[in-house]
Each structure stands twice: as C-alpha cells, then as structure tokens.
C-alpha cells in the first residue's frame, strides 16, 4: 500500500493510473466504501462523502489514463485509506495528514518558551525534528519545547515529520520580541547632550504598548522613574516625565531619549521596560551613563568619572603629546601643581579611549 503524507491546510494529489492511455470509468472511495468522486463519460461526479466540497480531479489528465484525486484544505481527519477503482483493479493509497502549530502565538518575548505541537492521525507514530534559524536541532514526539528563547531564534523554524520512512516538512516563522541590545553604555563629558536609543529587533505592522525608564543614579539611594510613555500604532506619546532631568522623547520608533546635559548626578544605570499589548511579560534594555569631569581648583588638577565603570578601565591625566602623569584603575585621579598647557583626562579600556576631556592650565606668575 502506497503511503502519502499531507500537511493540514494544504492540497494533496493522490495518483491513480490505468494501463490504457485513454479516458475510462474510475471511482475513488474511502475505506468505508463511500464514493468520493468518479466520472460519467467526460463529466466529474461526486459521491456523498464528507470531502464533497474539497475533492476534485484533473479532467485534462483523464485522456492519458491518469485519474488523480485532489483534496484541498486538508484536515487531520482526512487521514484514511483511499481506493481508486479502475479497469477492475483497485489501487490503495494511505493518506496521513499532519499539522504542526506553535503554542498560542508565533510572536514570543525573549526568555519565553516555544512549544510546537504535532497533530497526527490516530494510529500513527511520527517523529519530529526541528531546526532553529541558528542551526540548533531539537527532536521529539507529539510536542517539542524550547525554553528561554533568544534573539537568534527569530526566523524560520524548519520541522520534518517522519512516518513510514516518508517525510513532510513544515516551516514556522517565529518572531522573538526583544530589543536589539540587552545592554548599552554611553560615555559623556559633563555638560554634553546624551542620547539613548532603544532599537527593537523586530518589525510589526502595528505596535501598541506602554513603557517606562527607571533610573538608578550612582549618587542616589533609590531608583526613580524618569519617564513613562505609551506606544500606539508605532507612535510614541509621553505620559509623564520627571522635572529633573527634563528628558525629551522622540515620537517615532526606534525609542529614543535625549538628556539635555550629562551631569554627575545623572550618572548611573537605567532599565527601560516595554509592555506590549496582548503579551504577558515585558521587554527590557539596560542603559548605563558614565560622566567625566575635569576641574582645576587652585593647585590641584582633578579628573573624575561617575557611573558604572568596569574595574579594568584606566583613568589617566596627561599633558598633551606627553606620557601620562598619572594613570590608575580608579574613578578619580589628580595632579598637584600641574604645569601649564593643555591637559587631557582619558578613560580607556585596553588602550582604547572611551572618553576624553581637555582642560587648559594657565601659567602661574
């Protein structure tokens, strides 16, 4: 008996061939001997089966001795043995229809789990193997689960269902809802304007939700809500903004915030959360601000940084075009009685300058 695998919702064509290459009488029946369709001369006739409105044939092939049964919009319950009667012969084809669906939604938040469920006909024992867009293979039976979805899991998942040494392939598009970056750091000199950007890693037609930026300043004992906003059809509208600092927010995606000036009291870490409509959970992006200040008070030249710096960062004070006078893995360095000239305060990571502030020291007479 020939086995054909079909996909739920698709169209399948079951073949039936006569030895005579001409149009002769044929019938397709199901395992209960109920007629599905056949012919009467050059006319297609249909029986009382439940496939009535979804069954068809190709009349153009009858003259060649081919009498296919076409079943549209396949359902799991269409799985059956179909019998083609032609020239006093019976050809049997076993059709097995499978369906593969993602749990609840194909748009999932980063960190959530994806469950793929296989619908299969009674009596079948299929195996399923899925390949994620990043090349990870998972195997299972009726259900497959992937916990802790990552951004790289966005894309087309290709799943192969194997039954009776035949296979059928499913493609499921999964969108992992997340920010492009989990964390970012902005380095600024005191007084400079600060821009924070929160690009999303996905695009959808309409995007609705609400968000908030909480800020933990290094100098503050507790965190503070800096801004709350709504997102409707991709348009951003500010609901509430703190008076200090007076943030500005762009009205279009990607989410974008501007701080008029970097000040030591703003240095710290923020957490932007975005709750999307009809989704449980929130998207998060961490943002960090490091602020540098170089000052000269009487005979003391000081350079300080505030904010979340890593212990391996180096803070240096040097006279332009000269070797560093002082270089430490600390958040403040100073030089007593600095000589006249343009001094540079540098914050660097393995030789790469992250932040630089210049201060002119005038000669003392």
């Amino acid at each position: 008996k020939k086995v054909v695998l079909g996909k739920k919702g698709d169209t399948v064509e079951l073949t039936c061939t006569a030895s005579q290459k001409k149009s002769i009488q044929f019938h397709w029946k199901n395992s209960n001997q109920i007629k599905i369709l056949g012919n009467q001369g050059s006319f297609l006739t249909k029986g009382p089966s439940k496939l009535n409105d979804r069954a068809d044939s190709r009349r153009s092939l009858w003259d060649q001795g081919n009498f296919p049964l076409i079943i549209k919009n396949l359902k799991i319950e269409d799985s059956d043995t179909y019998i083609c009667e032609v020239e006093d012969q019976k050809e049997e084809v076993q059709l097995l229809v499978f369906g593969l669906t993602a749990n609840s939604d194909t748009h999932l938040l980063q960190g959530q789990s994806l469950t793929l469920t296989l619908e299969s006909p009674p009596g079948s024992s299929p195996s399923v193997q899925c390949r994620s867009p990043r090349g990870k293979n998972i195997q299972g039976g009726k259900t497959l689960s992937v916990s802790q979805l990552e951004l790289q899991d966005s894309g087309t998942w290709t799943c192969t269902v194997l039954q009776n040494q035949k296979k059928v392939e499913f493609k499921i598009d999964i969108v992992v809802l997340a920010f492009q970056k989990a964390s970012s750091i902005v380095y600024k000199k005191e007084g400079e304007q600060v821009e924070f950007s929160f690009p999303l890693a996905f695009t959808v037609e309409k995007l609705t939700g609400s968000g908030e930026l909480w800020w933990q300043a290094e100098r503050a004992s507790s965190s503070k809500s800096w801004i709350t906003f709504d997102l409707k059809n991709k348009e951003v509208s500010v609901k509430r903004v703190t008076q200090d600092p007076k943030l500005q927010m762009g009205k279009k995606l990607p989410l974008h915030l501007t701080l008029p000036q970097a000040l030591p009291q703003y240095a710290g870490s923020g957490n932007l959360t975005l709750a999307l409509e009809a989704k449980t959970g929130k998207l998060h992006q961490e943002v960090n601000l490091v602020v540098m200040r170089a000052t000269q008070l009487q005979k003391n030249l000081t350079c300080e940084v505030w904010g979340p710096t890593s212990p391996k960062l180096m803070l240096s004070l040097k006279l332009e075009n000269k070797e560093a006078k002082v270089s430490k893995r600390e958040k403040a360095v100073w030089v007593l009685n600095p000589e006249a000239g343009m001094w540079q305060c540098l914050l660097s990571d393995s030789g790469q300058v992250l932040l630089e502030s210049n201060i002119k020291v005038l000669p003392t007479w």
């Epitope: 821009e195 409707k232 348009e235 509208s237 500005q248 762009g250 009205k251 501007t258 008029p260």
Partner: antibody, heavy 118, light 107 residues
Framework: EVQLLESGGGLVQPGGSLRLSCAAS????????MSWVRQAPGKGLEWVST????????YYADSVKGRFTISRDNSKNTLYLQMNSLRAEDTAVYYC???????????WGKGTTVTVSS | AIQMTQSPSSLSASVGDRVTITCRAS??????LGWYQQKPGKAPKFLIY???TLQSGVPSRFSGSGYGTDFTLTISSLQPEDFATYYC?????????FGQGTKVEIK
Amino acid sequence: EVQLLESGGGLVQPGGSLRLSCAASGFTFSTYAMSWVRQAPGKGLEWVSTISDNIGNTYYADSVKGRFTISRDNSKNTLYLQMNSLRAEDTAVYYCTKDNEDYYMDVWGKGTTVTVSS
Amino acid sequence: AIQMTQSPSSLSASVGDRVTITCRASQGIRNDLGWYQQKPGKAPKFLIYAASTLQSGVPSRFSGSGYGTDFTLTISSLQPEDFATYYCLQDYNYPRTFGQGTKVEIK
C-alpha cells in the same frame, strides 16, 4: 488623488470663536494622523495641532493650548479645529495637513484665512 | 520645545548655481527632519523626510543630509521653478517646530 479642502475661515472679533473644517478624500482617512499648520501674513510656518489616527491622541502648540481643540469625524472624513478666545495674533492662513506613515506632513490643503480684528 | 535655526534667512542665486541651506536643532533629533518648499500664495510642498529621503516626484537635484543637530538641504543646480522659501521641520517630538525659513531669490 489625495485632496484636503479647508473651510470655515473668516473675519472674527477678538475673543470670538470659529470652527475650521477640512474635508479629506483620496485616502483612508481614519488610518492617518492629521494636523493644522498656520502662517501669519508675511511670516513663517507655525505648527498648531495634531490628532493621531483612530486612537485620537491630541497635541497642541503652547500658543493655542486651552483655546483650540482639534477633532476628527472618521465617518465623514473630516478634520476640525475649534478656535475659541481668538486673539489678533491668531490671524493667519490655516492649512490642514495629512501625515504619512512616517508621521511627516506630506499633503497640504490650499488653506483658509482667519482674520481676528475689531 | 526644540528650536530650529535656519540659515541663511535669504540668499540670491542664479539658475544653475549650487545652493545649500542649513538647519540646526537645539538638541539631537536623530534624522527626524523634513524640508518643505513654499511659493508665494501657495501651500507648502513636501520635499524631503527623514533628513535625506526624497519624497516621490521631487526632482533629484534636491538632496538632504545630516543627523543629530545639523542638517543641510542642497539644490545641485538651481532651476527657475526653485525660487521659493524653504522650511525645515523637526518631527522628533511635539511641539513640532519649523525653522524660520530661507528665501531663495533670483540674483
């Protein structure tokens, strides 16, 4: 063809009221934000107000906040600007504009003139 | 509110000239900037959005550039129909603000 036609302008005394209308055609009105922009005689362009699409968020310039009200009737494809407590400095040509998908004002009407004078 | 400063306020040029108009924002506005052209007695015409994207139907002699606070509108070879007033508009957030305009006149 996308078209915007303003009406309702005229001469009004200071402290008076006026309601401007803008009839839209040639596009799916309910899916786009709409705005009013004005231009005083011999002066530059000044944004007045915006109403987002069917959600209906409204935004105003500080100079008109509390006096002007923007609204829309999606069933009639019409945008309105209710202007109360009018002042001499509100004298201008008022343009109705349509926002595109990127929220830029891409289509403008021909304008209607509002004169506030005693 | 974000202030938009346009310069020059007016300029005289001849047909075929290359013309540059600049617009400066009082704070960073990404590339959320549009350019409009207005002729006397007419409604403004939309030329450029997102700082550098030409609106369909606008001749390719018009181009825009910039990001953050500094933006430029360039007309590579001025044509007779280009004599008009040009406005920049910040579309970063509300209130939307226009530059004061640059009048391009015939020399």
